[in-house]
Interface confidence: low
């Protein structure tokens, strides 16, 4: 899917837009809000009834190079006694983010935007049960 | 920036780090993944820490539509379907990268922007502070 131009019948392109070759776009990778920090409750990955672990994936040809992925620790959920209850399910919650991929073709370098699906954490759900007729 | 191994046969002019500004192909790789969480799963309703999804729409951003989760309850839903306030529903937040039109309203000029989104909720045991 191409990044949409501003899809409005009334829209006038500002005069100040930089010239861009056809089929490509100019991307400044100096991140706005670079120093913003997540302010989640402490250790929720361990305190959750559907706890998870984090794994850092590293790819030098991706920007950002580091992407953190969560994995649910259990198939079931942790009950009040601290035991796994398999009548409930721990399931991953996912979110898309954008990354920039650097591609090498011979000595030339090109850049491609890529959607990456990140597993953010896990939640405990009641399972869907399909009854056999 | 990030360091990359370079083909030894190539001229040595390329910076090891990503340049500050790059020209990017307009087509997005992996573009067909489902962006609407309501369509991709019903976890938001089936969770013991259910959440509502709020639509945030901004044509100056790509993707222009982002869904934000808000936990429905302070507590969690127990086996009887009631809210148990001995447990807490808390949002799971994630920093994601989006594109911001820069200068504003330009069709093919963007800057990466980091935004914080609440993706869903999870049920946690509360932190209890005992008074000495």
């Amino acid at each position: 899917r191409k990044i949409p131009k501003v899809g409005h019948t009334f829209f006038q392109k500002p005069e100040s837009c930089p010239p861009v070759p056809g089929g490509s776009m100019k991307l400044d990778i100096g991140i706005i809000n670079e120093n913003q920090r997540v302010s989640m409750s402490r250790n929720i990955e361990s305190r959750s009834t559907s706890p998870w672990n984090y794994t850092v994936t590293w790819d030098p040809n991706r920007y950002p190079s580091e992407v953190v992925q969560a994995q649910c620790r259990n198939l079931g959920c942790i009950n009040a006694q601290g035991k796994e209850d398999i009548s409930m399910n721990s399931v991953p919650i996912q979110q898309e983010t954008l990354v920039v991929r650097r591609k090498h073709q011979g000595c030339s370098v090109s850049f491609q935007l890529e959607k990456v699906l990140v597993t953010v954490g896990c939640t405990c759900v009641t399972p869907v049960i399909h009854h056999v007729q | 920036g990030i360091t990359i191994p370079r083909n030894p046969g190539c001229p040595n002019s390329e910076d090891k780090n990503f340049p500050r500004t790059v020209m990017v192909n307009l087509n997005i790789h992996n573009r067909n993944t489902n962006t609407n969480p309501k369509r991709s799963s019903d976890y938001y309703n089936r969770s013991t820490s259910p959440w509502n999804l709020h639509r945030n729409e901004d044509p100056e951003r790509y993707p222009s539509v982002i869904w934000e989760a808000k936990c429905r309850h302070l507590g969690c839903i127990n086996a009887d379907g009631n809210v148990d306030y001995h447990m807490n529903s808390v949002p799971i937040q994630q920093e994601i990268l989006v594109l911001r039109r820069e200068p504003p309203h330009c069709p093919n000029s963007f800057r990466l922007e980091k935004i914080l989104v609440s993706v869903g909720c999870t049920c946690v045991t509360p932190i209890v502070h005992h008074v000495a």
Partner: antibody, heavy 124, light 111 residues
Framework: EVQLLESGGGVVQPGRSLRLSCAAS????????MHWVRQAPGKGLEWVAV????????YYADSVKGRFTISRDNSKNTLYLEMNSLRPEDTAVYYC?????????????????WGQGTTVTVSS | QSVLTQPPSASGTPGQTVSISCSGS????????VDWYQQVPGAAPKLLMY???YRPSGVPDRFSGSQSGTSASLAISGLQSEDEADYYC???????????FGSGTKVTVLG
Amino acid sequence: EVQLLESGGGVVQPGRSLRLSCAASGFIFSNYGMHWVRQAPGKGLEWVAVISYDGSNKYYADSVKGRFTISRDNSKNTLYLEMNSLRPEDTAVYYCAKVGASGDYYYSYGLDVWGQGTTVTVSS
Amino acid sequence: QSVLTQPPSASGTPGQTVSISCSGSHSNIGRHPVDWYQQVPGAAPKLLMYYGGYRPSGVPDRFSGSQSGTSASLAISGLQSEDEADYYCATWDDRLVGYVFGSGTKVTVLG
């Protein structure tokens, strides 16, 4: 020329049903989100419902939730509003309106094209 | 009772500037762009301003809009007799999960 033409209004008794239609022309109907907005006599504008370009998402005002259904037939370039369990307070001119930008937008560019409206009177 | 509050009326003489305010909350104006509509008696509403302060083609530059925090405003400079109409602000509301209109402001051109 971009046009929206509502029809189906009339006088109806409380508790009865009515179906409004909105015929679209002059633009690619299947690319745009669509709204219904109403205006009671001598009163302000009240939003009723919105439907996404492909019909997959629908939202309603609390005052009509569970009674009204918004739908669309992209092959016929037509928007519908099915109104059940009508009440006297539903008496109004009903307008259909097009979202100003194509694709997955509901509101960022406003409602740029409006029909002339169709009058619904709920009275015994 | 609308969640977006507007003054019921505003007036001015030809050539004057009239401002209309629209006050909301964090769940609507605080998060989403505001649109403005003009409705002359007996006609359908017309989009006057979108995305806080952008004019559709055909709308004179005498109309300007701004938005900050949880409020927005519409200014009409060089007021003309044809500006006599009802004006509505509108935006999306996250709490109500829907589009909401302001209560409306009737602008009267005096003299």
